[in-house]
Amino acid sequence: PEPPTACREKQYLINSQCCSLCQPGQKLVSDCTEFTETECLPCGESEFLDTWNRETHCHQHKYCDPNLGLRVQQKGTSETDTICTCEEGWHCTSEACESCVLHRSCSPGFGVKQIATGVSDTICEPCPVGFFSNVSSAFEKCHPWTSCETKDLVVQQAGTNKTDVVCGPQDRLRA
């Protein structure tokens, strides 16, 4: 055959030999030679390799440290790492989810646009005209002002983004 400039897929070149890479879940014990195939061994308990590889050591599964607010979302296998997520009310500080922080609350004048998940924080939005929030909350949306008219009342005090309107009785006209 024409000498390949590079070995084929799932192979690597060493000592003028195209050796087979080890499959996911296995590590390299010895390179192939002119007479022997690549030798691979399965990763041990709590170890993994997720690609075709020539690694001599498997990677350790991620530890989901409860002291950092972490818990196991998906247990690792010999081919996949453990996936961590955060305890209820907490979310990851990064994509790698190495630690957790408490979900933020939306201050008065702001409502929850998107409730936090294990991997994303609360998203707040300012209450627009006609809406208010008078609490600090990780769940509450902006509430619409009370409609005095539907209650046959009149606005006595205008609402703000932090307070509801105050309704009162209409002035009765004497005959």
Partner: antibody, heavy 119, light 108 residues
Framework: EVQLLESGGGLVQPGGSLRLSCAAS????????MNWVRQAPGKGLEWVSG????????YYADSVKGRFTISRDNSKNTLYLQMNSLRAEDTAVYYC????????????WGQGTLVTVSS | EIVLTQSPGTLSLSPGERATLSCRAS???????LAWYQQKPGQAPRLLIY???SRATGIPDRFSGSGSGTDFTLTISRLEPEDFAVYYC?????????FGQGTKVEIK
């Protein structure tokens, strides 16, 4: 052009010895692993022995282990097979063959030399 | 050692027909370290296929190899007169390397 030329075959009595040679040309001999493969009359192919390019490692079929010795002289571009304690079942055409680039397969073969073990 | 069993022992076909030769290993041939050779009477063997499916230099594309693990196949899509010969499979996963007993492809 790659050429492999075996020599040293012939008639030998059981228990006797023979040394086969394989003269190589047309390629960088020292870069390639080499092998001996034999074929008994009217039978199939049998891998006999192999040697790494540098001569550091040698491999044998169980049927010849302890009786045959493979060696090479890279300065002379020559492969050898020393055959001792020969038996009737060693009667065969002996081929030398070189490895293909990068892979474990045999891409060039000599025309063979006949070894006959008979009393 | 890995024992290779080829079937059928003899294949009687006409030129232009498709030939399918089988090679079965007694244990898994690691990473498809399997080759196919052609041998004609009075000649040395000729490498056709290596690593189960790669054609050697100068081998026509009517020859193709496939398979992995313990089951391998050599296919000749359309037999030419010069293809009638004996075919051997050989494993090189680890020494001792071994050959199958051969399949003879003869003219019907």
């Amino acid at each position: 052009e790659v050429q492999l030329l075996e020599s040293g075959g012939g008639l030998v009595q059981p228990g006797g010895s023979l040394r086969l040679s394989c003269a190589a040309s047309g390629f960088t001999f020292s870069d390639y692993a080499m092998n001996w493969v034999r074929q008994a009359p009217g039978k199939g192919l049998e891998w006999v022995s192999g040697i790494k390019s540098g001569g550091s490692s040698k491999y044998y079929a169980d049927s010849v282990k302890g009786r045959f010795t493979i060696s090479r002289d890279n300065s002379k571009n020559t492969l050898y097979l020393q055959m001792n304690s020969l038996r009737a079942e060693d009667t065969a055409v002996y081929y030398c063959a070189k490895h293909v680039d990068f892979y474990r397969a045999l891409d060039y073969w000599g025309q063979g030399t006949l070894v006959t073990v008979s009393s | 050692e890995i024992v290779l069993t080829q079937s059928p022992g003899t294949l009687s076909l006409s030129p232009g027909e498709r030939a399918t030769l089988s090679c079965r290993a007694s244990q898994s041939v690691k990473n498809s370290s399997l080759a196919w050779y052609q041998q004609k009477p009075g000649q040395a063997p000729r490498l056709l296929i290596y690593t189960a499916s790669s054609r050697a230099t100068g081998i026509p594309d009517r020859f193709s190899g496939s398979g992995s693990g313990t089951d391998f196949t050599l296919t000749i899509s359309r037999l030419e007169p010069e293809d009638f010969a004996v075919y051997y499979c050989q494993q090189s996963s680890a020494p001792p390397w071994t050959f199958g007993q051969g399949t003879k492809v003869e003219i019907k």
